[in-house]
């Protein structure tokens, strides 16, 4: 039959080449002369010329050694034609299977593999996996089947078999207890991969196993007792630096210290933080200490780590005796800010209030007083008694010095300590209004037509507070009422000025008297420009210029 069974050819053949493999034969050769040819990759297409055929005998030829790792199987087609070139057979499939030889060593995927495992782990814990590949066949032969082994371990502490490797997966695991980072932080394993499932060619690589830190060492105070001196009242003052040692990995959570004040700080006066570089405990004052109240504090501080301990460990405690040093403290005004109500315009020499300070120190120190800031210069203060009196006219309506009816003064108290210290207080005078301002119209200049004049509405303002303001009353004086009328509106905050008789074009004075609810009267002269015009006007028309 025109059929060829798959042909097996071993790779790396020694020849001689061309080498006869198999003979193509068509039974049509009894009737006519047959010529054979082959096509396909390896014959007439890349890789061209690996195989050829003798055209008349049909011998299939191999022209060169084969490499299974490059091409494991060739699929060719055999053709048979007669002398006239006519095809006498259907194209026949020729399968050439390249059989494997163990011509490739295993290759590790990396020269150096890196893995890590926590110190103190139990035997059986997986560390890492190494991988080697072998290009040879691992399905039909053992040529490409890799077996892993550990050749050596450095260092050999605590003994030389700390790890094992799974012969087929390459998984490295811990086989013995006793991994201690503080003694051996890193192991170097020389690993082997051997093909033929362990009986063939060997290649080596390195596996570096880093032993990771576990918190198996407690931080210890060194020293455990401290004495410190702190001036009273100092806030954020560094009292003492506490030093610890920890055998775990520096700058790791297992090494970084966490400090806790266990006792002796009933008033919550102290705080302790960890210095980020030195790992020291920095004890500072959270509040000022009071020598007069307590001149010595004994603190008990415990140290642990950021990370929890992996096993039960004793914690280290330090004792710190803090001596509070006496400081001359400043007098303190009571209250620090004093609000006093006082009527504006009180007579000079009239007392305003007494404002005094207390000295926290135990000795009876003499305190003297003075005014530190009095923007308008309205007040004086007795240096011995702290009596504040008026020396100027307190004016509630003085917008330069008074804000929202309040006049602010700063006073100073000084003790006779060595050196002397000072304290300040704030005196807030709430000025009570008196009816010291009459109503004033706005604007005080008007322009009006002498024919069909428009009523002029003037706003009334009064610097005083209610009830010393509206309702207002208006009255024209000095014969102004002959030509003009003045009426206050219903709301009582505007006055309407009207021209009631014809006046020739000119400028006139209108005498307007306004009084407030407390009958405080104010006379204002309104300058009225009368124009020859009808109705509404802003400036007089025509060539006339007012005088």
């Amino acid at each position: 039959d025109w059929v060829v069974a798959p042909i097996s050819v071993p790779e790396n053949g020694k020849g001689p080449f061309p080498q006869r493999l198999n003979q193509l034969k068509s039974n049509k050769d009894r009737d006519t002369k047959i010529f054979y040819s082959i096509t396909g990759p390896g014959a007439d297409s890349p890789p061209e010329g690996v195989f050829a055929v003798e055209k008349e005998t049909g011998w299939l030829l191999l022209n060169k050694p084969l490499d299974r790792e490059e091409i494991a199987k060739y699929e060719l087609y055999g053709h048979a034609v007669s002398e006239n070139g006519a095809s006498v057979e259907e194209p026949m499939n020729i399968s050439i299977i390249v059989t494997d030889q163990n011509d490739n060593k295993p290759k590790f995927t990396q020269d150096t593999f890196r893995g890590s495992v926590l110190e103190g782990v139990l035997p059986g814990t997986s560390v890492m996996q190494v991988t080697a590949t072998d290009e040879d066949d691992a399905i039909y032969t053992y040529n490409g089947v890799v077996a892993y082994s550990i050749h050596s371990q450095e260092p050999k502490d605590p003994h030389d078999l700390m790890f094992t490797i799974h012969r087929s997966t390459g998984t490295i695991s811990v086989i013995s207890s006793g991994l201690d980072r503080e003694k051996v932080p890193e192991y170097t394993l020389t690993i082997q991969a051997t093909d033929m499932d362990g009986d063939g060619s060997t290649t080596t690589a390195v596996a570096v196993v880093e032993i990771l830190d576990a918190n198996d060492n407690a931080p210890m105070f060194d020293p455990q007792k401290y004495e410190a001196h702190v001036p009273e009242n100092a806030v954020g003052h560094e009292v003492q630096r506490l030093t610890v040692t920890d055998l775990d990995a520096p700058n790791s959570p297992a090494w970084r210290a966490t400090y806790l004040i266990m006792g002796g700080d009933d008033g919550d006066h102290f705080t302790i933080t960890t210095h980020p570089e030195s790992n020291q405990g920095i004890l500072t004052t959270r509040k000022g200490l009071d020598f007069e109240a307590k001149n010595q504090h004994t603190l008990y501080v415990e140290v642990t780590n950021e990370a929890p301990f992996v096993l039960k460990l004793p914690t280290s405690t330090a004792t710190i005796v803090v001596h509070v040093e006496d400081v001359n403290e400043a007098p303190v005004f009571v209250p620090p800010s004093k609000v006093v109500e006082v009527q504006e315009g009180i007579p000079t020499g009239e007392p305003v209030c007494v404002y005094t300070a207390e000295d926290p120190d135990k000795e009876n120190q003499k305190i003297s007083y003075r005014i530190l800031r009095d923007p308008a210069g309205w007040l004086a203060m007795d240096p011995d008694s702290g009596q504040v009196t008026a020396v100027g006219t307190l004016d509630r309506e003085d917008e330069q010095f008074v804000r929202n009816n309040i006049y602010e003064v700063m006073v100073l108290a000084m003790d006779n300590g060595s050196p002397p210290t000072t304290g300040t207080g704030t005196l807030l005078l709430t000025l009570i209004d008196v009816n010291d301002h009459g109503p004033v119209p706005e604007p005080r200049q008007i322009t009006i037509c002498n024919q069909s004049p428009v009523r002029q509405v003037l706003n009334i303002t009064d610097k005083d507070l209610s009830p010393h303001t509206s309702p207002f009353q208006a009255q024209l004086t000095d014969d102004s009422d002959i030509y003009w009328t003045a009426e206050v509106n219903e709301e009582g905050d505007t006055v309407v000025l009207s021209l009631k008789k014809f006046l020739k074009q000119d400028t006139y004075d209108v005498h307007l008297s306004l009084s407030d609810h407390g009958n405080k009267e104010q006379l204002t002269v309104i300058r009225a420009t009368v124009c020859d015009c009808h109705g509404h006007v802003e400036t007089c028309p025509g060539p006339w210029k007012g005088g």
Epitope: L61, E83, G85
Partner: antibody
Framework: VQLVEESGPELVKPGASVKISCKAS????????MNWVKQRPGKGLEWIGR????????KYNGKFKGKATLTADKSSSTAYMQLSSLTSEDSAVYFC??????????????WGQGTSVTVSS | ELVMTQSPASLSASVGETVTITCRAS??????LAWYQQKQGKSPQLLVY???TLAEGVPSRFSGSGSGTQFSLKINSLQPEDFGTYYC?????????FGAGTKLEIK
């Protein structure tokens, strides 16, 4: 074994065609490959292509596809090469050379004496 | 296509001397290399095929060697009739390619 290129020197005009013959004797003409090789004056050898007279199978150097056409007549044991659309670049000596069929991997063991083709207007 | 690089391009030698010509293939051609000799105005003659097999009637002073990509032709005790141009040729895959030639002249 003898290969005789019967056509003498050819002088042809640009654009024309020429057909060179090569008569074989002393071996089984049908069962060996016939190669054709070009040599320009003072230059090296350049393979054009080959034909297997038994079934007429041909193989060309890509450079000469469309330029050269190879045929064979088994009855007269003669191989032919036709060159078309001639230019001055085609002026050369053309050899025929036999190659035995052993997977086509034998060298060219017998050569014709060569036919000179000159293309000139 | 395969490129065949031949060296030297030319050389002068005296009768009785030994000369070596080399040929390099741009890719592996195993042992499929032939050497030809061509005299002025004549057709090439096969000397060696399959890198080291002498063709019929070729004197034994000629010898070929090499495989893969590096080949050489050695002529011991040069004779007057050995002068001419020598070509190497790949006879592995088509297109069959030739070296540029080495012209051997009498000194």
């Amino acid at each position: 074994v003898q290969l005789v290129e019967e056509s003498g020197p050819e002088l042809v005009k640009p654009g024309a065609s020429v057909k060179i013959s090569c008569k074989a004797s002393g071996y089984a003409f049908s069962s060996s490959w016939m190669n054709w090789v070009k040599q320009r004056p003072g230059k090296g050898l350049e393979w054009i292509g080959r034909i297997y007279p038994g079934d007429g199978e041909t193989k060309y150097n890509g450079k000469f596809k469309g330029k050269a056409t190879l045929t064979a007549d088994k009855s007269s044991s003669t191989a032919y090469m036709q060159l078309s659309s001639l230019t001055s670049e085609d002026s050369a000596v053309y050899f025929c050379a036999r190659q035995r069929d052993y997977g086509a991997l034998y060298a060219m063991d017998y050569w014709g004496q060569g036919t000179s083709v000159t293309v000139s207007s | 296509e395969l490129v065949m690089t031949q060296s030297p391009a030319s050389l002068s030698a005296s009768v009785g001397e030994t000369v070596t010509i080399t040929c390099r293939a741009s890719d592996d051609i195993y042992s499929y290399l032939a050497w030809y000799q061509q005299k002025q105005g004549k057709s090439p003659q096969l000397l060696v095929y399959n890198a080291k097999t002498l063709a019929e009637g070729v004197p034994s002073r000629f010898s070929g060697s090499g495989s893969g990509t590096q080949f050489s032709l050695k002529i011991n005790s040069l004779q007057p009739e050995d002068f001419g141009t020598y070509y190497c040729q790949n006879h592995y895959v088509t297109p069959f390619t030739f070296g540029a030639g080495t012209k051997l002249e009498i000194k």
